[in-house]
């Protein structure tokens, strides 16, 4: 079978969804004739080469935009970014990008995601909301770090 | 600068082991996955497997499952492969290679000096 | 297992173009396959040119490209220099291993 990736939405314990400004993930209250990004994502094929019970290895992008989530150090800082990039083109490399990889965990309906080259930072979002993402390794309290992932068939 | 600094020369008798290092340096180890590949003399070049030394996980050519092990220790980083039940054919020139994803594609782009190792009895 | 084969030799001018090629016993050599080339000179250390098929690696000048031509990974080398005297080996990715080929000796003459 030819692998593609899975379509879903996304959104925070305070119901905030992901939208795309300026080329920025920013978290922001779902309002009427908002367009929340539709995520990407795509579970890597070398998932034995990386760590087991971490979760499951993904690449995350943005459906129809060729733009995927990665994670690259801004002086001794890991910060999140977005790339132009085809989620199917890291997929396919020889090796894992980790640069590119989260691992997604999952209990009960709420998701996070680790940056697997960072390990022990994850994706989050200031409680304050209307922010852009960004890591942390600071769980449970500025900063929100669980999401609801609902999957589109 | 990127620099990986292979051990010297080893003489080894067939059946015995023998173990090569690799030192990198100018690089974060963690961030990319070091090869392992040898050149026989004469012969091209012979893909023995890797390593991710951020997780430690290996993979190797199937011919060489189970005799070559590859190791790291990150606090030195530095890449081992220690090669057994060696036989006369395994002489050759082992060398490492950093394989480095670098804008859309990944690169064998540093390679060490190469290490003899030579199997007489 | 696949095997990679090369030409064992090829000659160049100064200045002239010459196609390097890299052929799979497994059937024709797709970009799945991830072709990179690696240059060794000698006395000096093996160098990284090509990845993913066609991407320079940093600081590889742009007289060197990676192609695929007729089922065959392809390095063309255009306006050759006498520096670029050398063997060029490919390398092959085949879901979980790598092969390479026994390499090809250019000579600039």
């Known amino acids: 079978k030819i692998d593609t990736p899975q379509r879903g939405s996304i959104q925070d314990i305070n119901h905030r969804v992901w939208v795309l400004q300026d080329q920025t993930l920013i978290a922001v209250p779902r309002k009427d004739r908002m367009s929340p990004v539709t995520i990407a994502l795509i579970s890597c094929r070398h998932v034995e080469t990386l760590e087991k019970d971490r979760g499951n290895p993904i690449y995350l992008g943005l459906n129809g935009l060729n733009l995927c989530l990665m994670c690259a150090k801004v002086g001794d800082q890991p910060t999140l970014q977005l790339k132009e990039k085809d989620i199917m083109d890291l997929y396919n490399q020889p090796e894992p990008v980790k640069s590119f990889l989260f691992y997604h965990s999952q209990s009960g309906r709420n998701s996070t995601f680790e940056s697997v080259a960072f390990p022990g930072w994850f994706i989050a979002v200031s409680s304050e909301g209307g922010c852009p993402l960004i890591l942390t390794q600071e769980l449970g309290k500025a900063n929100t770090t669980d999401f609801g992932l609902t999957m589109l068939f | 600068q990127v620099q990986l600094v292979q051990s010297g020369a080893e003489v080894k008798k067939p059946g015995a082991s023998v173990k090569v290092s690799c030192k990198a340096s100018g690089f974060n180890i963690k961030d990319t996955y070091i090869h392992w590949v040898r050149q026989a003399p004469g012969q091209g070049l012979e893909w023995i497997g890797r390593i991710d030394p951020a997780i430690g996980t290996t993979r190797y050519d199937p011919k060489f499952q189970g005799r070559a092990t590859i190791t790291t220790d990150t606090s030195t980083s530095t890449v081992y492969l220690e090669f057994s039940s060696l036989r006369s054919e395994d002489t050759a020139v082992y060398y490492c290679?950093?394989?480095?994803?670098?804008?859309?594609?990944?690169?064998?782009?540093?390679w060490g000096q190469g290490t003899l190792v030579t199997v007489s009895s | 297992q696949a095997v990679v084969t090369q030409e064992p030799s090829l000659t160049v001018s100064p200045g002239g173009t010459v196609t390097l090629t890299c052929r799979s016993s497994?059937?024709?050599?797709?970009?799945?396959?991830?072709a990179n080339w690696v240059q060794e000179k000698p006395g000096q250390l093996f160098a990284g040119l090509i990845g993913g098929t066609n991407d320079r690696a940093p600081g590889v000048p742009a007289r060197f490209s990676g192609s695929l031509l007729g089922g065959k990974a392809a390095l063309t080398i255009s306006g050759a220099q006498p520096e670029d005297e050398a063997i060029y080996f490919c390398?092959?990715?085949?879901?979980?291993?790598?092969?390479f080929g026994g390499g090809t000796k250019l000579t600039v003459l």
């Open positions: 497994s059937g024709a050599v797709t970009t799945s396959n991830y």
């Open positions: 290679a950093r394989l480095h994803y670098f804008g859309n594609n990944f690169f064998f782009d540093y």
């Open positions: 390398a092959l990715w085949f879901s979980n291993h790598w092969v």
